[in-house]
Each structure stands twice: as C-alpha cells, then as structure tokens.
Interface confidence: medium
C-alpha cells in the first residue's frame, strides 16, 4: 500500500515567441485544475484507456483574470498535492499523464465551460520511497514544472511497498528477512547480530550469535553450496558438529496466511492466495465491501447492498485472483508453437515466429509440405522446418518409397514367429506365451500373468489383449 504524489510547481507560457499570454485571453475569467492518470508499464497507451493504477483530480485553482498590460505571470494554481493511492504493489515502471484543464467562468448558459489546455505523458521508472523527482515538460506553447514521488504507507516498505515492517508494539518481531525500516527506524527492532563471518548473502539469524542458512547453502557460516554436502535439500540452522543443515521451517510452515488463505512458497519468501473478502500480504485485511474498492487492475466489483455483504471481483483479461491482484502469465502456458517467442502485450498475446513458421501461434509451417508428396499412401507431416512422411504399413523411408519388412525388428518375444500381413504383422507364440507380441507368460495353473484389468473391466471379464 502507498500513495503516488504529484506537486505542480508552475504552469505558464513556455519560452520563445508566440507563447500565449494567458489561458483566459479574451475569454473573461477562468481557473485551472489538473488531472493525473497513472498507467502500469512503459507502453504507449491510448489516452482513453483506463488509468489502471489510479487517477486524481486537483481542486480548482483561484480565479484568474488577464490584465491586458501586465506581463504574463505564472498562473495561480490549486493548493496542495495530487495524491493517487495504490493498494497493491508499486510497479516501478509506469506512465504518468498530467492534464491541465481550464474552466471558463464567463456568463455561460448552461454552466461553466471546460477545455483541455495541455497534456504531458512521461514513461518513467521510479522506486517507492525515493526522493522527489523533478521534471519540466512542454506541451504545445505551455510549460509545466512538477515533482513526483511514490511512498509507502502503513507498515509497507521496500521499492515496491510489498514488505511489511512490524512496529515494536506488535507481538512478533521484525522476523527473518525484515530489517528496520528507514521511516520507522525507532519502531522496528534492530536485527540480531549474527555469528561472526556468517554469509551476508546466504545466511541470516533470528537469535544473536546464530547463523542459519538459506536453502541451497550449508556450513557453519553458510558459505558451502549444499550440492557438495550430504544434506542437500534440508533447511535450517547449521549443526556445529556435522556442518549439516538441520531441517528448519520453510516460509509456509505454520501457514502465515490468515483467514483461510493458502500459502505457496516463492524464492526466499511466500505468497498468500486469499479467499474472497480478504486481501493483504497475509490476507489480514478483512471486512471489505465494494465501497472499499477491493478490485484491482480495473476489476469490476459486484456486491450486495448490505454493507456487510461480500463481493466478487470480475477481472479484466490478463488478471486473476480474488481481487484481480495477480497478472496472468499467459506465456507460461507456452502458447507459441514451433519454438516461437511469446510476448504478453497486456491487451493481447503475440507470438514472434521462427523463420519458416507463421500464424497467430506459429502453427503453420510455411513450406515443409509444399510440393512434397509421400508415396504409397503416406501422409506429409509438417514440423521442425523439414517435411516428414508418416508411411502406410509395409512402407518406409523419407518418402515412403521403400518396402518395409514389419518383421525385421523381431517384434515377437519369447521365440514367437513373425508373419507379415497386409494389415501389419501377426505373432505366432511359442507354447506358454500369449499376447499380441507374445509378451505374457501363461502360468501352468492356467492363470495368465496379464497386467491388471484396465478401467471398465472387472477381473472376471474376458480380457481382450489378443
């Protein structure tokens, strides 16, 4: 959780000839206000696409009336910051759109009139918790000076506001992997001092003087890759005598997810999948209704009129989870065939095909079978940039032109005799064996050693293997 903040410093005519003296010239009094729109990622998007990370509108500024003879001043601006709260992780890369609007206050029939004066779009990388970033942008004849930042709120910390910092008053300490938070230095417990020499990268401690190893590392100071140890796959504090890892708790042990959330391990951490009505790092936030806006990423919230009723988020394409908080990695399903490269553009999937392949999913081989004929009833199969023939029984070779002896591979087991046949081959089994390839021995008591009956056959049913 956190908030994006935008401070407008000035808006006025840009330098150079032809710059307007005022937004209100010859129109009577007017006042300005600003709108900020945040979209995730760095892609160029249509102005009308939703502000998926949020939007905010400033108050309307003081009324401005142009003084004909006076030099053009910086225009009076609305007071305060524009703030766009975000509930989930700060994405780091985003598109910032700032619009400057004019409201004309002359005697208008039907109320005041609005018009858009300027729009600037910046694609930016910005870590949460950093200092104010300053910018100057020109839009047409106008110049806009502004600063912006993203900061975490509540107890969230980190460049994406996804780690939690516990105040000293909380029952549990900061815990493994959580260090004191810069803005809350006094309120978080200082991390314990680990055993001298304990690897900063691969070790950690919860009690002073200990050295616990992250998965994949071992040794008293967590400097030995676990693959060289006989204790591979174990986690936990190092044993002083053996150097082996004693099994310790995994990130999901004890289920850190509250309110019935399910825990899944991620590298070095965990992720909670929350039931409907709960969200947060550990599913700890509850009592949520549509009025709280629990559906992220443009999800549509549907709930009852009763304030205590639950809600359902209908997620837009590309997002999932009970709060539409998870981006679907649609490329993980490997939709691109024949080695095509998958690109998830957000609004659509695109496959970049290897040479020789085409189609939305690279499913068409451009020239494998073009002009290729497979002889003797064989069929051409596309694949791998070269054609292949699937030959009819009794034929083989690249183009099915060679006669194939189905018995050449000696398919009949246990001394069975092979006979070529128009439909393939037939095995005549030696005494004591049965099966299409003479693979099953027949026991003297008459019970065959056939495999267990397949689904749908009971042991007493006739077994049609021959």
């Amino acid at each position: 959780a956190g908030v994006f903040e935008l401070q407008i410093h000035s808006f006025g005519p840009g330098p150079g000839p032809g710059a307007p003296r005022s937004p209100c010239s010859a129109r009577g009094p007017c006042r300005l206000f600003f709108r900020v729109c945040l979209k995730p990622g760095l892609s160029e998007e249509a102005a009308e696409s939703p502000c998926a990370l949020g939007a905010a509108l400033s108050a309307r500024g003081p009324v401005y009336t142009e003084q004909p003879e006076a030099p053009a001043p910086d225009l009076p601006l609305p007071n305060g910051l524009l703030q766009v709260p975000f509930r989930d992780a700060w994405p780091g890369t985003f598109s910032l759109i700032i619009e400057t609007w004019r409201e004309e206050l002359g005697d208008q029939i039907g109320g005041p009139a609005w018009s858009l004066l300027a729009r600037v779009t910046r694609r930016r990388r910005l870590a949460a918790g950093g200092p104010w970033a300053r910018d100057i942008q020109r839009a047409g004849a106008w110049e806009l000076r502004f600063s912006y930042r993203a900061r975490c709120e509540l107890l969230a910390v980190g460049t994406a506001c996804t780690r939690l910092c516990r105040p000293r008053s909380a029952p549990s300490r900061c815990g493994p992997g959580l260090r004191p938070c810069a803005p809350l230095e006094d309120e978080c417990e200082a991390p314990p001092v680990c055993r001298a020499g304990c690897s900063l990268e691969h070790g950690f401690c919860e009690q002073p003087g200990e050295c616990r190893c992250l998965e994949g590392w071992t040794g008293p100071l967590c400097t030995v890759p676990a693959s060289t140890s006989s204790c591979l796959g174990l986690r936990g504090p190092s044993s002083a005598t053996t150097g082996c890892l004693v099994p310790g708790p995994g990130p999901c042990d004890g289920n850190p997810c509250a309110n019935g959330g399910s825990c899944s391990e991620t590298p070095g951490s965990f992720e909670c999948t929350c039931p409907r009505g709960f969200y947060g790092l550990r599913c700890e936030v509850s009592g949520v209704t549509c009025a709280d806006g629990p559906c992220f990423n443009g999800g549509l919230c549907v709930g009852g009129a009763d304030p205590d009723s639950a809600y359902i988020c209908h997620c837009p394409p590309g997002f999932q989870g009970s709060n539409c908080e998870k981006r679907v990695d649609r490329c993980s399903l490997q939709p691109c065939r024949n080695g095509g490269l998958c690109l998830d553009l957000g609004h659509a999937l695109r496959c970049r095909c290897r040479a020789g392949f085409a189609g939305p999913r690279c499913e068409h081989n451009l020239d494998d079978c073009a002009g290729r004929a497979c002889a003797n009833g064989g069929t051409c199969v596309e694949g791998g940039g070269a054609h292949r023939c699937s030959c009819a029984l009794g034929f083989g070779g690249r183009d099915c032109r060679e006669r194939a002896d189905p018995c050449a591979a000696r398919p009949c087991a246990h001394g069975g005799r092979c006979y070529a046949h128009f439909s393939g081959l037939v095995c005549a089994c030696a005494p004591g064996y049965m099966g299409s390839r003479c693979e099953f021995p027949v026991h003297p008591d008459g019970v065959s050693a056939l495999p267990a009956a397949p689904p749908g056959l009971r042991p007493g049913d006739p077994q049609r293997y021959l």
Epitope: F33, R35, C51
Partner: nanobody
Framework: EVQLVESGGGSVQAGGSLRLSCAAS????????MGWFRQAPGKEREGVAT????????YYADSVRGRFTISQDNAKNTVYLQMNSLKPEDTAMYYC??????????????????????WGQGTQVTVSS
C-alpha cells in the same frame, strides 16, 4: 459496450425526497462526467447536476442548488442524485448520462446535453402538490 441503468423514480408529495441511482457498466475513463438531466413534457432537456468521476467536482443547475446532491460510488461505478424538498416543477423524466470533455481543446459544458455520449432510458419523477 456502455450501459447506464437508472432506478429510484416514483411519485412523491411536494416537500418529499427521492434518491435516484444510475449504475454504469463498461465505462472506465476516470476524468469523465456522469450526470443527471431532466426533460419535462414539451420542454428541452436540461442539466440538473454533474460530477467528475474520480475528482468529486460537482456542478448544479441554479434551480436545484441546495436541494439536490449528486454523489458517486467509484467502486460500484454508480452515481446517485439525492433530491430533497421536491417541488411540482421538478416533475420530469430524469436521465442519467455519461461523457467527457474532448481532448482537443474544444469547449465542453458540464450542464449541457451535447458531449454526453451515453444515455440511460430514464426514470419518471412525479411531484404532486
């Protein structure tokens, strides 16, 4: 496709109150307006109140200022019109509308029908003396 569905109309005595609701689906651009217009028999459609999505900026016609309040629930994509101290001259068909200022600098009038691209079917309000 954008759909606007009004509800809450009805008959009421002068001095009474009604609350109109307009649920929008398929409508997301957050600098746009949602508003209420009304049309009495034989008269032109006129603006009653409009609100800027996401910003809370509101506009009211002089005839209703102080009596009507427009509000919105962003999470439900719904806009409301609370009508108090109703008068017989408030009798009309009330329409919910959605639209937005053009992005090319052209003028836009929040309380005039032109520029509102999407309209609901309307809900009847009748105030008897």
């Amino acid at each position: 496709e954008v759909q606007l569905v009004e509800s809450g109309g009805g008959s009421v005595q002068a001095g009474g109150s009604l609350r109109l609701s307009c649920a929008a689906s398929g409508y997301t651009y957050s600098s746009n307006f949602m508003g209420w217009f009304r049309q009495a028999p034989g008269k032109e459609r006129e603006g009653v109140a409009t609100i800027v999505s996401g910003g809370g900026t509101t506009y009211y016609a002089d005839s209703v200022r102080g009596r009507f309040t427009i509000s919105q629930d962003n999470a439900k994509n719904t806009v409301y019109l609370q009508m108090n101290s109703l008068k017989p001259e408030d009798t009309a068909m009330y329409y919910c509308a959605a639209g937005g200022p053009p992005t090319n600098g052209a003028k836009w009038y929040p309380l005039r029908p032109p520029g509102y691209n999407y309209w609901g079917q309307g809900t009847q309000v009748t105030v008897s003396s």
